[in-house]
């Protein structure tokens, strides 16, 4: 299953990056799982994951750095609290869980660049 | 003549970006001209240019946003005062001016990403 995502995204100076993950659904899925994985220096780590029912809100864990909304075959993902050291390739993985058949799609990744802001001068 | 430069550079939160432009000199040039061009939306504009004698300092115009140093066939370029709207592909053009023969080399460009910082809160 094909998954499309932008090649490059810049995090804002507040450390927030948003991108769209779009999948070409071969069937009429009602339950979808979206996972964001970060690849840097050939290491892959799971950033966040959410399962949602089509037409409903994505619900990530309470302590997750991700939030998102869905619209048809598009998922709008936002990752917060990013620092320069979090710069890397963020890969969108989509699984059509239900009803069968199961489909898996993995995007080529979005390179997120993060620049740490200069500290503001002390206000004396 | 081959010119090498990095594919991507992030400007600092102060709007400063530095990169190295390296050329494979076919001869023993004594006078070299370096030009930085910016390509965005298929428009190419000249950012800055400097001519230098090998072993000497690069001297850009006083009001130039560029500064630089040279070391052998490497030129270390720094561009200052960058804003988010200045994000684009910065191409390094190197000309071996003297002695003849004249050589021209153009790099593939360095994509410079610039993020505007959040304003600091007013200190009341």
């Amino acid at each position: 299953m094909h998954v499309a995502q932008p090649a490059v995204v810049l995090a804002s100076s507040r450390g927030i990056a948003s991108f769209v993950c779009e999948y070409a659904s071969p069937g009429k899925a009602t339950e979808v799982r979206v996972t964001v994985l970060r690849q840097a220096d050939s290491q892959v780590t799971e950033v966040c994951a959410a399962t949602y029912m089509m037409g409903n809100e994505l619900t990530f864990l309470d302590d997750s750095i991700c939030t998102g909304t869905s619209s048809g075959n598009q998922v709008n993902l936002t990752i917060q609290g990013l620092r320069a050291m979090d710069t890397g390739l963020y890969i969108c993985k989509v699984e059509l869980m239900y009803p069968p058949p199961y489909y898996l799609g993995i995007g080529n990744g979005t390179q997120i660049y993060v620049i740490d802001p200069e500290p503001c001068p002390d206000s004396d | 003549m081959h010119v090498a430069q990095p594919a991507v550079v992030l400007a600092s939160s102060r709007g400063i970006a530095s990169f190295v432009c390296e050329y494979a000199s076919p001869g023993k040039a004594t006078e070299v001209r370096v030009t930085v061009l910016r390509q965005a939306d298929s428009q190419v504009t000249e950012v800055c240019a400097a001519t230098y004698m090998m072993g000497n300092e690069l001297t850009f115009l006083d009001d130039s946003i560029c500064t630089g140093t040279s070391s052998g066939n490497q030129v270390n370029l720094t561009i200052q005062g960058l804003r988010a709207m200045d994000t684009g592909l910065y191409i390094c053009k190197v000309e071996l001016m003297y002695p003849p023969p004249y050589y021209l080399g153009i790099g593939n460009g360095t994509q410079i990403y610039v993020i505007d910082p959040e304003p600091c809160p007013d200190s009341d």
Partner: nanobody, 112 residues
């Protein structure tokens, strides 16, 4: 190299039990959401169960109350306990996680 290897399948009578294992090499299972899938003869893949990095589990309605997903973090192995097996549970079972494609699978055959 990142690899997943399933084992533990076999032939069993309806109502019987099996425990499937998925051994991971090249990555730490507990850091990822891991999924069990199955494919019945002549059919497409079907999602069976998932365990996330925090340990939360979910199951397809068809196996709820009969199957249990778990993992051994020390051994880096994912398990699927299959109880009260039914003929419809026959198929090839696969594990999947992270960016890995699924393993080779292990065959489960349930007969009457």
């Amino acid at each position: 190299q990142v690899q997943l290897q399933e084992s533990g399948g076999g032939s069993v009578q309806a109502g019987g039990s099996l425990r499937l294992s998925c051994a991971a090499s090249g990555f730490t299972l507990s850091s990822y959401t891991m999924t069990w899938l199955r494919q019945a003869p002549g059919k497409g893949l079907e999602w069976v169960s998932t365990i996330n990095s925090g340990g939360s589990t979910s199951y397809a309605d068809s196996v709820k109350g009969r199957f249990a997903i778990s993992r051994d973090n020390a051994k880096n192995i994912l398990y699927l306990q299959l109880n009260s097996l039914e003929i419809e549970d026959t198929g090839m079972y696969y594990c999947q996680g992270g960016l890995t494609q699924r393993g080779q699978g292990t065959q489960v055959t349930v007969s009457s």
